[in-house]
């Protein structure tokens, strides 16, 4: 309704004698700002005076004067929206109705708030979830409909009177909607908490007790069991009797079924709290427990380990590992079911007792071929001696032994011969399956362990074979000692170190890389002509005419080998120079004359110099000198000089005659 003032605040506020009350409040006036405010206790409307009667706890007027007794009550609001109040301390007789009389310029309003003040601090309230199960986390809530800024309080949780270790989360609310203090505790109850008392205790700031609330925990849990056995150590011999009893120490709700388990498997027709085992056998050894169920689930007792003792059974031998490789380590394990465990063992190798071996395991650190055979054992405990089992076979494997490579040919072997070799060995386990040869070659193996080398190479120095099973054993290499004609024959210049110039002393060496047999002869030839029979060919003073193609031959008792042809090049300065003239040495004036400098040189002439009859050099450097147009004055003797990297050479004089043309003669 638009004619009402709008207020928001908690409907009722709770406190106790000596505490305080904080009243959160908001309002919206109908028009303008608040001009007057009076707080009544239990106001009543007087129709005669058209005013409210009652105790005035607080009054504020236009002039702003406030009576001095009003310090206990405080208006913390303002002139347009906040109407929050505080009473500190609060007294029992403050209980009842508080009336907020508000006046603006033209409007008035009375707003009522209930105040409930008790004589003593009222207790908080504990809230529990509908069901609590063991080991499942729950939240316990303690709620108190009180909070005031001027009166700090605390909520503490106790289990069976002892403060709880878990950290609680405390929250407060002082709003227009609600005023409270709340404590929340997260807690994982165990079955042992069932029936225990939980307390939420209200305390003042100093920890002084004010009030509390208590609840009894109802923790649902599976049955908790204890198992008892006779005899108490659960150790018996075959034929003895055993009794086991199951006791329920706690169950919530009540249990419904009972069963017994052996090694995790349910025992048929055993549904009472007592399990009787008569004349036990060794097969009944194992781990026993009882299982009792309720609506929460099954509960199991601790396990009882029943040991039925008996003499060792026939033994078996386990070998780690067979087949074994020679040189490796091997372990033998004697396996015999017995209770108690065997205390003594006797070992046998091929039926013969192994001295000094009394342990469950026999360790041989380095296996040799003679360790092969059958291994068996006998186990012994306090109840007797077992029987010897069938035993286990140890197979010792090793590479082929004493491998040798044998040449089948008559000696000596010559390059190009066919050579046959065989690969022999003494013993092997497992059997030899293949052979290898070193070096590798495209050779024939006509049968296993035989190698045929067709057209044996000069460089087939040694051959080795290997006989192979799982491993290869190599024989020492055998020398073929192949005989061959001299190899890699070549001509080598040993003097001079640089290029050969005419007049030099020259030495050529006939080199070869190898020969077998080593005794050799040499032959030198040039253009099919024999020059010498030494390893060196010497020229005291070389001439250009010695240039040409040289070969040397080296022979031994197997054959002879020739070098590649080697070209001997002789460098010399230009020689045999001459000037030739074209079209001839007599030319008519006005025509052209070409002079050519001809020479023999190695390397070829790089440039030429031309001279006239007065030895004056002409500015030409090429092989040809062209005079065009030629003049009578050009008549005379010309000569040329050729130059190469070795030196210079000059020609004799050649005379050019230039005669007058008919026109010139006609003019004279």
């Amino acid at each position: 309704d638009s004619s009402k003032w709008v207020f928001e605040h908690p409907e009722t506020l709770y406190a106790w004698e000596g505490a305080c009350v904080w009243i959160p409040c908001t309002y919206r006036a109908l028009d303008g700002d608040l001009e007057s405010f009076i707080l009544f206790h239990n106001p009543e409307y007087n129709k005669n005076t058209s005013k409210f009667d009652g105790t005035r706890l607080y009054e504020s007027t236009k002039d702003g004067k406030v009576p001095s007794e009003q310090k206990r009550v405080q208006f913390l609001g303002d002139k347009n929206k906040n109407c929050t109040l505080s009473i500190h301390p609060v007294h029992l007789n403050d209980s009842g109705q508080l009336g907020l009389r508000m006046e603006s310029k033209t409007e008035k309003w009375m707003e009522r708030i209930h105040l409930n003040v008790s004589e003593r601090p009222f207790p908080p309230h504990i809230q529990l979830p509908p069901e609590i199960q063991e080991s499942q986390e729950v939240t316990l809530t303690c709620l108190l409909n009180f909070s005031c800024y001027g009166y700090p309080i605390q909520l503490q949780w106790l289990l069976e009177g002892v403060p709880m270790r878990q950290a609680a989360v405390t929250s407060t609310s002082l709003t227009i909607k609600s005023v409270f203090t709340r404590s929340e505790l997260k807690f994982s109850p165990q079955w042992s908490h069932h029936g225990k008392i939980v307390t939420c205790q209200l305390q003042d700031a100093d920890g002084k007790f004010l009030s509390n609330d208590t609840v009894q925990l109802n923790v649902k849990h599976t049955p908790k069991l204890e198992i008892k056995v006779t005899p108490s150590d659960a150790i018996v011999r075959e034929g003895d009797s055993v009794t086991m009893t199951c006791e329920v120490s706690s169950s919530n709700p009540e249990y419904t079924t009972v069963s017994w388990l052996k090694d995790g498997t349910s025992l048929k027709k055993q549904n009472t709290f007592t399990l009787n085992l008569r004349e036990v056998t060794k097969d009944q050894s194992g781990k026993y427990c009882c299982q009792v169920s309720n609506d929460v689930g099954p509960g199991r007792s601790e396990e009882v380990f029943l040991q039925v003792q008996y003499a060792p059974e026939p033994s078996t031998v386990q070998i780690l590992h067979s087949p074994a490789v020679e040189g490796s380590q091997v372990e033998f394990l004697c396996m015999s079911l017995a209770n108690p465990l065997p205390t003594n063992y006797t070992w046998y190798h091929n039926g013969k007792e192994m001295q000094g071996r009394t342990e469950e395991k026999v360790h041989i650190p380095k296996i040799l071929p003679w360790h092969a055979g059958t291994y068996s054992c006998v186990a012994e405990n306090i109840l007797g001696t077992g029987q010897r089992g069938p035993g286990a076979e140890l197979d010792v494997q090793y590479p082929p032994k004493k491998v040798t490579t044998v040449i089948q040919n008559p000696m000596p072997i010559r390059e190009g011969d066919t050579v046959t070799l065989s690969c022999n060995y003494n013993s092997s386990n497992p059997s030899v399956t293949r052979y290898e040869w070193k070096p590798h070659g495209a050779w024939e193996e006509p049968s296993l362990g035989v190698l045929k080398i067709q057209n044996v190479g000069w460089d087939n120095t040694t051959i080795a074979c290997a006989a192979c099973n799982s491993w290869c054993s190599w024989a020492s290499p055998v020398a073929l000692n192949v005989q061959y004609a001299p190899r890699d024959v070549r001509v080598r210049k040993i003097k001079p170190l640089s290029e050969i110039h005419s007049g030099n002393s020259v030495s050529l060496q006939c080199d070869f890389s190898s020969s077998h047999p080593k005794e050799v002869q040499f032959f030198w030839e040039k253009n099919g002509r024999l020059l010498g029979k030494e390893s060196q060919l010497n020229f005291d003073s070389i001439s250009p005419e010695d240039a040409g193609s040289y070969s040397c031959w080296v022979n031994n008792s197997i054959g002879q080998t020739a070098s590649k042809a080697w070209t001997l090049e002789v460098l010399y300065a230009p020689r045999r120079l001459r000037v030739s003239m074209s079209p001839g040495d007599q030319v008519m004036e006005g025509k052209s004359a070409t002079l050519t400098c001809e020479s023999d040189a190695n390397p070829p002439v790089s440039h030429y110099t031309w001279f006239d009859w007065n030895n004056q050099s002409l500015p030409y450097h090429s092989q040809k000198l062209r005079l065009e147009p030629v003049k009578v004055q050009h008549s005379g003797a010309y000569w040329c000089q050729g130059t190469n990297s070795v030196g210079k050479g000059r020609s004799p004089l050649s005379t050019l005659t230039v005669y007058y043309s008919p026109e010139t003669i006609g003019r004279r």
């Epitope: 440039h607 006239d612 007065n614 004056q616 002409l618 500015p619 450097h621 147009p629 050009h634």
Partner: antibody, heavy 119, light 107 residues
């Protein structure tokens, strides 16, 4: 100090004869270690050697094949100079013409004459 | 006729750079190879004669090498006044022939 001074017309009509003179100072045209050359330069042909005259025990001439039928290079010992005559010129003969001494390379050059062949 | 081929035909460089110009003859000319520098509007100037000999008055940063058919002109550290056109020329036989020139410009 050798100097070469060129003289002659800068404009010649087509089919006429181009005549240039190169006066030598600091050396002799009759030197038996030098050769006296004419070289021309145009954007289309670059540097082009035309010919030379030189004296050893007699006077000699060498000419480029491209101008052999039209060129004459003459020494004038009395004036210590040498000349170039190029007959039947065409616009293709338009170029800067240089005279140069050759001892070991063209070590001295004239100042150059721009000759334009135009009607 | 002997043909002279210069490479490159032009190149850009900076002051202080080392520059190399090559010249190849169509046949062997021994060491009868000369190098010239020409600036616009001026006659060519002889730098190197007989392939490697420095002409009198030419700075030592210029050097020449080669014989036969392949020749090189090197400027060891370019100076501002070195930007010009360079020519090679053979004097082995007539007709005397020049290379087409290499234009060296500032980068």
């Amino acid at each position: 100090q050798v100097q070469l001074q060129q003289s002659g017309p800068g404009l010649v009509k087509p089919s006429q004869t181009l005549s240039l003179t190169c006066a030598i100072s600091g050396d002799s045209v009759s030197s038996n270690s030098a050769a006296w050359n004419w070289i021309r330069q145009s954007p289309s042909r670059g540097l082009e050697w035309l010919g030379r005259t030189y004296y050893r025990s007699a006077w000699y001439n060498d000419y480029a094949v491209s101008v052999k039928s039209r060129i004459t290079i003459n020494p004038d010992t009395s004036k210590n100079q040498f000349s170039l005559q190029l007959s039947s010129v065409t616009p293709e003969d338009t170029a800067v013409y240089y005279c140069a001494r050759d001892v070991e390379g063209f070590d001295y050059w004239g100042q150059g004459t721009l000759v334009t062949v135009s009607g | 006729d002997i043909v002279m081929t210069q490479t490159p035909s032009s190149l850009s460089a900076s002051v202080g750079d080392r520059v190399t110009i090559t010249c190849r003859a169509s046949q062997s000319i021994s060491s009868y190879l000369n190098w010239y520098q020409q600036k616009p509007g001026k006659a060519p100037k002889l730098l190197i004669y007989a392939a490697s000999s420095l002409q009198s008055g030419v700075p030592s940063r210029f050097s020449g090498s080669g014989s036969g058919t392949d020749f090189t002109l090197t400027i060891s550290s370019l100076q501002p006044e070195d930007f010009a056109t360079y020519y090679c020329q053979q004097s082995y036989s007539t007709p005397i022939t020049f290379g087409q020139g290499t234009r060296l410009e500032i980068k």
